[in-house]
Interface confidence: medium
C-alpha cells in the first residue's frame, strides 16, 4: 500500500494509506510553514519549501537524526510549488510572489530563472522527465495550466477554461494523463497532457482541495478546510474515503514510491551532457539543453557558460 508524504505546515509526515491503524509518522518537525514537498526516492531525500522562512530545505529518510539542510535560502518569498526531477537531478519550484519558476541542482547550486513573465500566482508544479515537459498551475487573474519544456522551451497554455483556483496538479506517468483540483469550482478533472480530452473525476463535493497525487488507480488529495487527506478512484471518482483527519494543516502531498519516479537513461548522465553547468531535459532533439545560472551567458559552443558562473 502506498506511503503518502505530506507537508503539514509545522512538520512533514508520512502515512501508510493502506494501514489498519491510520497514524502519521513525523519525518521532520519544528518547521515554520512547510508548504510544498517532494522527494528523490533513489537517495531517500525529502525536499520541502517553507513559506515563512522563505527557503527550500532537505533531509534524508531512514537516517536517525538526519540533519536538515538548507538548499535555497535567498531570493524566495512564497515558494508554493516544488518538484524534484529525479532523472536530471534538479529541483524546480514556483514562487507566487516573485512570480518566477526556477530550477537548480539538488544542492541549490547553478540556480536559473526559467520563467518570470506572464506569471501571476503560480502554484503547483509537476514534471514528466521521460518526455522533458513541466506543468504548472496559475490561479491568478487569468487562471490556467501551462506546459513547457523542462529547459524553458515551448511554453504553452493547455487549460484556460472552466478553471478558477487550480491548486493540486499531478501526472499519471503510465497513462499520460494530467490531473488537477480546483478549490473554487470544487472538482478534480483530468485530461491528456496537451489539455485535450478533458474528463470529470470528482465534482461538487469537495471543500477546498489543495494538493493532489496518485498511485495505481487511486488519487489522493489534501483539503485545507477539512484538514484531512482523501482518496478516490482516479477514473470514476468512486470509492471515496478519508485517509487521515484532524491534521494541523495539510498542504502538499506525494506518493513516496519508486513507481512514481521510474528511472531511465539520459544524455545528461554522461559527463553532464558536456554542459559546464546545467544539463536540462528537453522535449525536442537531442532531448537535453545546456543552460547557465541566471545572469551568466552560454558560450557559442552551446555547452560552456561564460566566466563568472
Amino acid at each position: 500500500s502506498p506511503l503518502l508524504l505530506f507537508a503539514n505546515r509545522r512538520d512533514v509526515r508520512l502515512v501508510d494509506a493502506g494501514g489498519v491503524k491510520l497514524e502519521s509518522t513525523i519525518v521532520v518537525s519544528g518547521l515554520e510553514d512547510a508548504a510544498a514537498v517532494d522527494f528523490q526516492f533513489s537517495k531517500g531525500a525529502v525536499y520541502w519549501t517553507d513559506v515563512s522562512e522563505e527557503a527550500i530545505k532537505q533531509t534524508y529518510l531512514n537516517q536517525t537524526g538526519a540533519a536538515v539542510q538548507n538548499v535555497v535560502i535567498s531570493g524566495l518569498v512564497s515558494p508554493d510549488g516544488l518538484a524534484c526531477d529525479w532523472v536530471g537531478k534538479k529541483l524546480y519550484w514556483t514562487d507566487s510572489e516573485t512570480n518566477r519558476i526556477e530550477v537548480a541542482n539538488l544542492n541549490g547550486t547553478s540556480r536559473k530563472v526559467l520563467f518570470w513573465q506572464d506569471l501571476d500566482q503560480p502554484r503547483a508544479i509537476a514534471l514528466d522527465p521521460a518526455h522533458g515537459y513541466m506543468y504548472w498551475t496559475d490561479w491568478g487573474e487569468t487562471p490556467r495550466i501551462e506546459r513547457a519544456g523542462m529547459d524553458g522551451s515551448t511554453r504553452k497554455i493547455i487549460v484556460d477554461s472552466d478553471i478558477y483556483w487550480p491548486n493540486g496538479l499531478t501526472i499519471d506517468l503510465e497513462e499520460q494523463k494530467l490531473y488537477w483540483a480546483d478549490a473554487k469550482l470544487s472538482f478534480i478533472h483530468r485530461a491528456n497532457l496537451d489539455g485535450s480530452f478533458r474528463q470529470k473525476v470528482v465534482e461538487g463535493s469537495l471543500t477546498h482541495p489543495f494538493a493532489l497525487t496518485l498511485s495505481g488507480d487511486t488519487l489522493y488529495w489534501t483539503d485545507w478546510q477539512t484538514r484531512s487527506i482523501h482518496a478516490c478512484n482516479k477514473r470514476t471518482g468512486g470509492k471515496r474515503k478519508e485517509i487521515l483527519s484532524a491534521l494541523y494543516s495539510p498542504m502538499d502531498i506525494q506518493v513516496l514510491s519508486q513507481e512514481r519516479q521510474p528511472f531511465f537513461h539520459t544524455r545528461c548522465e554522461e559527463d553532464n551532457g558536456g554542459c559546464s553547468h546545467l544539463c536540462l531535459l528537453s522535449p525536442s532533439e537531442p532531448f537535453y539543453t545546456c543552460a547557465c545560472p541566471t545572469g551568466v551567458q552560454l558560450q557559442d559552443n552551446g555547452r560552456t557558460c561564460k566566466a563568472g558562473a
Partner: nanobody
C-alpha cells in the same frame, strides 16, 4: 483559542488619521498571521490588510494601498493599522483577524473562513 480585542476607532474628519490596535491573548501571537477587515453598513466584510508572522511581508487591498500601514509588535502581542488620508468611504467597523498562514493574493485573504479568529470590531467614522 486566541482572543482579539480592537481599539482606537472613533470619529475623524476626511483627510485625518487614526491608529487602530488589536491586542491578542490566549495563544502564541508570533505563530499567527494577522489581518484587518472592514464592514460598512449594508455591505460584505472586505479585506483591508495582512501581515505575515515574521512581519517581513505585508499585503493591502488596492483601495487602501499607500494610505494604510499594517505593522505588528510580537513582544506586545499587538497588531496595528495606521490609517492616513481617511475618506468617507473608509467608514466601517474594522475587525482584526488571525490565521496560521497568509496568502499574497486578496482572493485568499478575503475568504473569511481562512481566518480562524476574529475580534468584535471597532467603529471608524469619517465625516465632516
Amino acid at each position: 483559542a486566541v482572543q482579539l480585542v480592537e481599539s482606537g476607532g472613533g470619529l475623524v474628519q476626511p483627510g485625518g488619521s487614526l491608529r487602530l490596535s488589536c491586542a491578542a491573548s490566549g495563544g502564541t501571537f508570533s505563530s499567527y498571521a494577522m489581518g484587518w477587515f472592514r464592514q460598512a453598513p449594508g455591505k460584505e466584510r472586505e479585506f483591508v490588510a495582512a501581515i505575515r508572522r515574521s512581519g517581513r511581508r505585508t499585503y493591502y487591498a488596492d483601495s487602501v494601498k499607500g494610505r494604510f500601514t499594517i505593522s505588528r509588535d510580537n513582544s506586545k502581542n499587538t497588531v496595528y493599522l495606521q490609517m492616513n488620508s481617511l475618506r468617507p468611504e473608509d467608514t466601517a467597523v474594522y475587525y482584526c483577524a488571525a490565521a496560521r498562514r497568509v496568502r499574497s493574493s486578496t482572493r485568499y485573504n478575503t475568504g473569511t473562513w481562512w481566518w480562524e479568529y476574529w475580534g468584535q470590531g471597532t467603529l471608524v467614522t469619517v465625516s465632516s
